[in-house]
């Protein structure tokens, strides 16, 4: 058993078929030590008198609050939770596994540039009960500060007969430095909360491979004379590391046409204009990723042909 | 070039060279498939290789303030991966294909290295532990770490010469 | 927790093979290289050598004729083998372990040492 | 091989005094590449194993008190102990581990004035 926050323990089970659980010694905080009685949530089942009561937790019904009482008068609060462990590994109930980029991925995070800011967003099927609190450091052995806001819920989207709801969170490293190279990851720890349902999940990343610049902006065409080629140009989106001299981006430049069986003319560049081909009824989309260091390509900017 | 009076090294030159080297290591690194460098619960590697940390004066003010602190700490790092690719790490078994780019990779390092230090000039004298002796089985586990670490560093490189090209340069 | 535990005869007639175990547990032999060090009553310490995690050895040129080391991974266990002892031969004799890494690293635990007296 | 001198052979202090020990290698344990010095101290009590103190040069091992500390670069190095408590007296050795052979200082006894 251990301290989640005051008043709030986490009793810690193996969770198998006639599982022994286990013993908690539950403490009245109070300097009272006579007349003292134990209730359990909203029912006046006295379980037990004393400064002290000793449960044996196997299933989520011996879970919820412990009030202690003398007279009718509230001395103190405890509120058991319970963390299961099957197999020897914990449950993931709460949050859905996103599975991109690869299974058993319960959190995703993206950063915009370099700055230390980053965000990171979950998954659930579970719409009340629940809350979400989240803490990140630079490294684990000697951590550096991380300050990550409140959790909030961002998206609800109906996937078949379910709804899903995107909760997200905002992350700025204390004392980043966008210029150095990273040599200890960012580690994130969300503890998911539902209903008496405790558990707790990680993610652990270096800035520079959750980098997702945002597109391009600005794109605009200009026709040359006499001739169906067109110049695309562009600029860095807002949100870049600056100076764009040393935060340097590469582009990709394409050509689509209205069928998605046309074939994809395709231009690289590190310049923020190039000259192409433009069909009617096309459109002319481009991105961007890191010049030096390949992580996510930005979604589309894109402006019709015609 | 950088030289003992302290004055520029070919910013141009390096920024191109520099480039290579960013599309190099990660044309390289995909030779031992995918992994999660993390997953391995092992510091160790990613601790016992250089990086370019605050202080080194790679940011751009710093640059602009004394490049020679950034030249020099990427010229040792330089220095570090060029013998850590030219190790049994990557020279022994399994062998590498033949047309892996860690070959170009090693040469490229070299290639830097010689231009922010040319003949007749030395920052200081280049020490490196023994490597500890490793197996097959450890050795694709460490080319994977070690390219996965150049990719960062030299990604910090890259942007160095980048800029010192593009602000820098006489 | 982490356990090394040498064990052995703490007597060895001189021109005989001196032949110690330690018993590992706690970690992973896949993560670790087991080193012998000795100490002779009232000296210094002298590294003896060291078994990698991939089986290969390292001695002390000073002893590297006279050593043998080698590991019994399914029992957990690494031998130390002297042969040739001599009274110069008297130490506690200690195994350690180190983190494999690129480069070699220093001991963090130790066994609590055997004393091997060479005598006739 | 890498020749470790320990100064001073032995060191007579009070409880409460400063205690610092030297340690100089033959050559350079600082790899310039990653910065790191190759070198550990350790503590040892009669009849017991060494004990890690210090790794890295500087690196405290966990759970040894905040009066040990570790100092110096290349070929010379310091164990500083701030405040001497009865429990630190014993012999200490420094340890390179930058090129193997791995050598040992030979020691710098700590004894009660």
């Known amino acids: 058993i251990w301290e989640l926050k005051k008043d709030v323990y986490v009793v810690e089970l193996d969770w198998y078929p006639d599982a022994p659980g286990e013993m908690v010694v539950l403490t009245c905080d109070t300097p009272e030590e006579d007349g003292i009685t134990w209730t359990l949530d909203q029912s006046s089942e006295v379980l037990g008198s004393g400064k002290t009561l000793t449960i044996q937790v196997k299933e989520f019904g011996d879970a919820g609050q412990y009030t202690c009482h003398k007279g009718g008068e509230v001395l103190s609060h405890s509120l058991l939770l319970l963390h299961k462990k099957e197999d020897g590994i914990w449950s993931t109930d709460i949050l859905k596994d996103q599975k991109e980029p690869k299974n058993k991925t319960f959190l995703r995070c993206e950063a915009k540039n370099y700055s230390g800011r980053f965000t990171c967003w979950w998954l659930t099927t579970i719409s009340t009960d629940l809350t979400f609190s989240v803490k990140s450091s630079r490294g684990s052995s000697d951590p550096q500060g991380v300050t990550c806001g409140a959790a909030t819920l961002s998206a609800e989207r109906v996937r078949g007969d379910n709804k899903e709801y995107e909760y997200s969170v905002e992350c700025q490293e204390d004392s980043a430095c966008p210029a150095a190279e990273e040599s200890l990851p960012i580690e994130v720890m969300v503890d998911a909360v539902h209903k008496l349902k405790y558990e707790n999940y990680t993610s652990s990343f270096f800035i520079r491979d959750i980098i997702k610049p945002d597109p391009p902006k600005n794109l605009q065409l200009k026709p040359l004379k006499n001739s169906r080629q067109v110049e695309v140009s562009w600029e860095y989106p807002d949100t870049w590391s600056t100076p764009h001299s040393y935060f340097s981006l590469t582009f990709c430049v394409q050509v689509q046409g209205k069928s998605k069986r046309e074939k994809k003319d395709r231009v690289f560049t590190d310049k923020t204009s190039a000259t192409v081909i433009c069909r009617k009824n096309a459109s002319i989309s481009v991105r961007a990723q890191d010049r030096y260091y390949s992580s996510s390509w930005s979604e589309w900017a894109s402006v019709p042909c015609s | 070039r950088a030289v003992p009076g302290g004055s520029s090294p070919a910013w141009t030159q390096c920024q191109q060279l520099s480039q290579k080297l960013c599309t190099l290591a990660w044309s390289a690194h995909p030779l031992v498939g995918h992994m999660d460098l993390r997953e391995e619960g092992d510091e160790e590697t990613t601790n016992d290789v250089p990086h370019i940390q605050c202080g080194d004066g790679c940011d751009p003010q710093g640059l602009r303030d004394n490049s020679q602190f950034c030249l020099q700490r990427i010229h040792q790092g330089l220095i570090f991966y060029e013998k850590l690719l030219g190790s049994d790490i990557f020279t022994g078994e399994p062998s590498l294909l033949p047309d892996s780019p860690v070959g170009q990779l090693h040469a490229s390092l070299l290639g830097l290295s010689q231009l922010l230090q040319p003949e007749g000039h030395h920052w200081e004298t280049q020490q490196i532990p023994s490597l500890s002796p490793s197996q097959p089985w450890q050795r694709l586990l460490l080319r994977f770490k070690i390219l996965r670490s150049l990719q960062a560093f030299v990604a910090v490189a890259a942007r160095v010469f980048a800029h010192g090209a593009a602000t820098l340069s006489p | 927790q982490v356990q090394l535990q040498e064990s052995g005869p703490g007597l060895v007639k001189p021109s005989q093979t001196l032949s110690l175990t330690c018993t590992v547990s706690?970690?992973?032999?896949?993560?670790?290289?087991v080193h012998w060090i000795r100490q002779p009553p009232g000296k210094g310490l002298e590294w003896i050598g060291v078994i990698w995690t991939g089986g290969s050895t390292d001695y002390n040129s000073v002893l590297k004729s006279r050593v043998t080391m080698s590991v019994d991974t399914s029992k957990n266990q690494f031998s130390l083998k002297v042969n040739s002892v001599t009274a110069a031969d008297t130490a506690v004799y200690y195994c350690?372990?180190?983190?494999?890494?690129?480069?070699?690293?220093?001991?963090?635990?130790w066994g609590q040492g055997t004393l091997v007296t060479v005598s006739s | 091989e890498i020749v470790m001198t320990q100064s001073p052979a032995t060191l007579s202090l009070s409880p409460g005094e400063r205690a610092t020990l030297s340690c100089k290698p033959s050559?350079?344990?600082?790899?310039?590449?990653?910065?790191?010095?190759?070198l550990a101290w350790y503590q040892q009590k009669p009849g017991q194993a060494p004990r890690l103190l210090i790794y890295?040069?500087?690196t405290r091992q966990s759970g040894i008190p905040a009066r040990f500390s570790g100092s110096g670069s290349g070929t010379d190095f310091t164990l500083t102990i701030s405040s001497l408590e009865p429990e630190d007296f014993a012999v200490y050795y420094c340890l390179q581990h930058f090129n193997y052979p791995w050598t040992f200082g030979g020691g710098t006894k700590a004894e009660i004035k």
């Open positions: 050559q350079s344990l600082l790899s310039s590449g990653n910065r790191k010095n190759y």
């Open positions: 890295y040069a500087s």
């Open positions: 350690a372990r180190d983190k494999y890494g690129l480069f070699p690293g220093y001991f963090d635990y």
């Open positions: 706690g970690f992973s032999l896949i993560s670790y290289n």
